[in-house]
Interface confidence: medium
């Protein structure tokens, strides 16, 4: 399908002008290539009428032009002095007329209505309000005022000053007679319907002295605003319906093939399941306007959208609406990234978030989509640091790999972490993306102690066991803080024979703290990565305490990675069994809040690993 997009139908009246905007993917080639507007003939050929290279056909001379806006990826064709002969089928496109990078546009030019002399024309959108002004002479001031609608040769009474209201206008029309001295009465019609379209007659008095004024009311369906967005990107519909409906329920709906409108979201709590996790209805402003954000755009999201107001929270005739025609460009600049990331309870996920690579300095954010209250998104972490304290020790936002992608790592997963998360920046809002985290059955691949109590001044060795599939990955330990995870210095011992054969005993990377200080207290992560792409992580909390007398419970300060056959040494001192390495009951129960101000560093902390080879791929 062509990525060029424009209005499908354009209608106007003889003598008027039209402006037709066409969109294209703003690639370097597209920005500079020829743009054209051509008319389709009976033979199927498309004859150029105007192009960006300065050509204007004789038929269009002096009344048409084409302007390219390469920075926006749009071009505009303006045609003036329209005649009935301009009605027909056209194409706006790029390159050669026959190449297919084009969009079909139907132009219909109709004859303007023949109106009686002195007719006032009122042009109003459906659902809005019109005020018809009706002048009269002094002698008719005390006489009956009325508004009629002309239907064929007959005139049907709509409203008069004797309190008659036509049933078709019930509860939405009023006639206002001003105070003395003002020789004008007004008729206000609210919530205009398409059927209200037509010629009206104001009348004051009767007989030959009566005052009459014709009014032509043109009720228009709102012209849809064209919206051109990239696949996987984000769109925002700003809906301004006016103060008169400020306190009425609002909705966004999508027009279906039956020309009815399916609610996408409304302020009464309804939401289409197809938009679960990727839609927010932002609260309305004091003027009654509101906005709807949709992320993770799909090709099937294309179509005509209407926003409106009605107490039922859905489309009803005669209520104000606003319209958009959404086109989703498949030649997207937004890279593919997983829309679903799976993790196991106790394990971790590493989420890749795209951003506009031109905005590398932008602030990065990650928020958790909540379905309550029309959708909202509390920030969890940003590139400046952690936002929500309940994620302490298990969430980090990394600028890597960079060049249009940042990484968010979440570990110590529970079933409550399942849900939709949004990747955001303070730059180009079209790059908002959505990822769903699913918690599946399984065991974490990296095994670390549940938590560890270290003894001040002694040596602590924390093991991290990994499976063979991570043998070629880079292994690391880092100390978590609310601004990131500081990698600890590594002592590479080089690949051993045992490691090449993925020996049982070699699948281990250990963190050594020697000697343990108060500043070492906090969260530590063991992880695997491949270059700048992060895989799984496992977290362990290290509490630091004074040396205790015999009988107190602590992990052996000399080593926390005992061999599989080691057992309880005495009533209080227990070493870690390999198969139970995740069992937190083997460690001190207390969980001390991490001091994130100081980092473990220097030669006191070291990481022992059997390999320094590069990571072979992401763990998820």
């Amino acid at each position: 399908k062509s990525p060029v997009f424009g209005p499908q139908e354009v209608s106007s009246v003889e003598g008027n002008s039209v402006s037709i905007k066409c969109y294209y993917p703003p690639t370097s080639v597209n920005r500079h290539t020829r743009k054209y507007w051509c008319r389709k003939g009976a033979s199927g050929r498309c004859i150029t009428l105007v192009s960006s290279e300065g050509y204007v056909s004789s038929n269009y001379a002096g009344r048409a032009n084409l302007t390219n806006f390469p920075e926006n990826g749009t071009f505009v064709v303006n045609i003036a002095q329209l005649s009935r002969d301009d009605s027909g089928h056209y194409k706006c496109g790029l390159g050669i007329n026959s190449r297919g990078l084009s969009f079909d546009v139907s132009l219909e030019v109709s004859q303007g209505p023949e109106l009686p002399n002195g007719t006032e024309v009122y042009t109003v959108d459906v659902g809005r309000t019109v005020t018809i002004k009706c002048p009269f002479k002094t002698e008719n001031a005390p006489k009956t005022k009325a508004l009629y609608k002309k239907i064929g040769q007959t005139s049907v009474l709509v409203i008069d000053s004797r309190n008659y209201v036509n049933p078709n206008y019930k509860d939405r029309i009023r006639l206002r007679i001003p105070g003395t001295g003002q020789l004008i009465f007004t008729v206000v019609i609210d919530r205009l319907r398409l059927s209200d379209h037509g010629l009206y007659l104001c009348q004051a008095g009767d007989g030959s002295n009566r005052d009459e004024k014709n009014a032509d009311l043109q009720v228009l369906e709102p012209e849809p605003e064209l919206v051109y967005e990239d696949l996987r990107g984000s769109v925002t519909f700003h809906c301004a319906l006016g103060l008169e409906v400020a306190n009425v329920a609002k909705f966004l709906c999508r027009v279906n093939s039956r020309e009815t409108c399916d609610v996408v979201i409304n302020t009464l709590g309804k939401r289409d399941s197809a938009f679960e996790g990727r839609i927010l209805l932002n609260p309305q402003d004091k003027d009654g306007s509101f906005s709807v954000v949709i992320t993770g755009l799909r090709k099937e999201d294309e179509g005509r959208y209407l926003c409106g107001a009605h107490s039922d929270g859905q489309l009803q005739e005669g209520w104000p609406i606003q319209a958009w025609q959404l086109f989703v460009n498949e030649e997207s600049t937004i890279p593919r990234s997983p829309t679903v990331v799976k993790g196991v309870a106790g394990g971790s996920v590493a989420v890749l978030c795209p951003y506009n690579p031109k905005e590398s300095q932008s602030l990065k954010y990650w928020c958790l989509w909540e379905g309550a209250q029309n959708g909202r998104c509390p920030l969890l972490v940003e590139s400046q640091g952690l936002v929500q304290e309940q994620y302490e020790g298990r969430l980090s936002l990394l600028q890597e790999p960079g060049n249009g992608t940042f990484t968010v790592i979440l570990n110590q997963l529970t079933t409550q972490d399942a849900g939709f998360y949004w990747c955001l920046t303070n730059g180009d809002t079209r790059w908002r993306t959505t990822v769903e985290i699913k918690i599946i059955e399984g065991e974490p691949n990296l095994k670390v102690p549940g938590n560890v109590t270290a003894v001040l001044g002694e040596t602590l060795n924390i093991p991290c066991h990994f499976p063979c599939k991570f043998s070629s990955y880079e292994k690391y330990w880092c100390k978590w803080s609310n601004t990131g995870c500081q990698t600890l210095p590594s002592q590479d011992e080089g690949p051993s024979e045992a490691f090449v054969n993925c020996d049982e005993n070699s699948r281990l990377v250990s963190l050594t703290l020697n000697p343990v200080t108060r500043a070492d207290e906090g969260w530590y992560w063991c992880g695997v990565k491949q270059g700048h792409f992060y895989g799984e992580t496992a977290a362990v909390y290290v509490a630091v305490e004074e040396k205790k007398v015999a009988g107190s419970r602590y992990v052996s300060p000399a080593k926390a990675d005992a061999a599989p056959d080691e057992k309880v040494l005495d009533s209080g001192v227990r070493e870690i069994e390999n198969k139970a390495i995740q069992d937190p009951r083997l460690f001190a129960e207390e969980k001390v809040v991490a001091d994130t101000g100081d980092q473990a560093g220097g030669s006191r902390a070291s990481v022992d690993s059997s390999s320094s080879e590069e990571q072979g791929g992401s763990s998820k």
Epitope: P283, F290, Y365, C367, C377, L379
Partner: nanobody
């Protein structure tokens, strides 16, 4: 959390105007919904106004609609409350607050960062 400091309060006659400022430090307020609350002597703290992350959506208490305007300058990391046609009943300590919600409906309970407040006194 973001640190907030209010300024611009003072004594003003009924019908007069004041502009309160709220300067944020510690981190940018871009992703935050920001709000103003007030507490009159012997009364509970009440909502005055809020503004979303982009400044495109605002909301006001009925008692201040049409008189107060909330705005923000993300580049300056500052939120403002322009108060016109002040009334004696507007006398209170005004607090600036931040809520770490990028978007969507935010209830008053969701505001987690608070300033120390600035006194506004309107004399009749």
């Amino acid at each position: 959390q973001v640190q907030l400091v209010e300024s611009g309060g003072g004594l003003v006659q009924a019908g007069g105007s004041l502009r309160l400022s709220c300067a944020a430090s510690g981190r940018t307020i871009y992703g935050y919904v920001m709000g103003w609350f007030r507490q009159a002597p012997g009364k509970e703290r009440e909502f005055v106004a809020r503004i979303d992350w982009s400044g495109s959506s605002t909301d006001y208490a009925d008692s201040v609609k049409g008189r107060f305007t909330i705005s923000r300058d993300n580049a300056k990391n500052t939120v403002y409350l322009q108060m016109n046609s002040l009334k004696p009943e507007d006398t209170a300590v005004y607090y600036c607050a931040g809520s770490a919600y990028y978007s969507g409906y935010v209830t008053h309970r969701d505001f987690g960062s608070w300033g120390q407040g600035t006194q506004v006194t309107v004399s009749s």
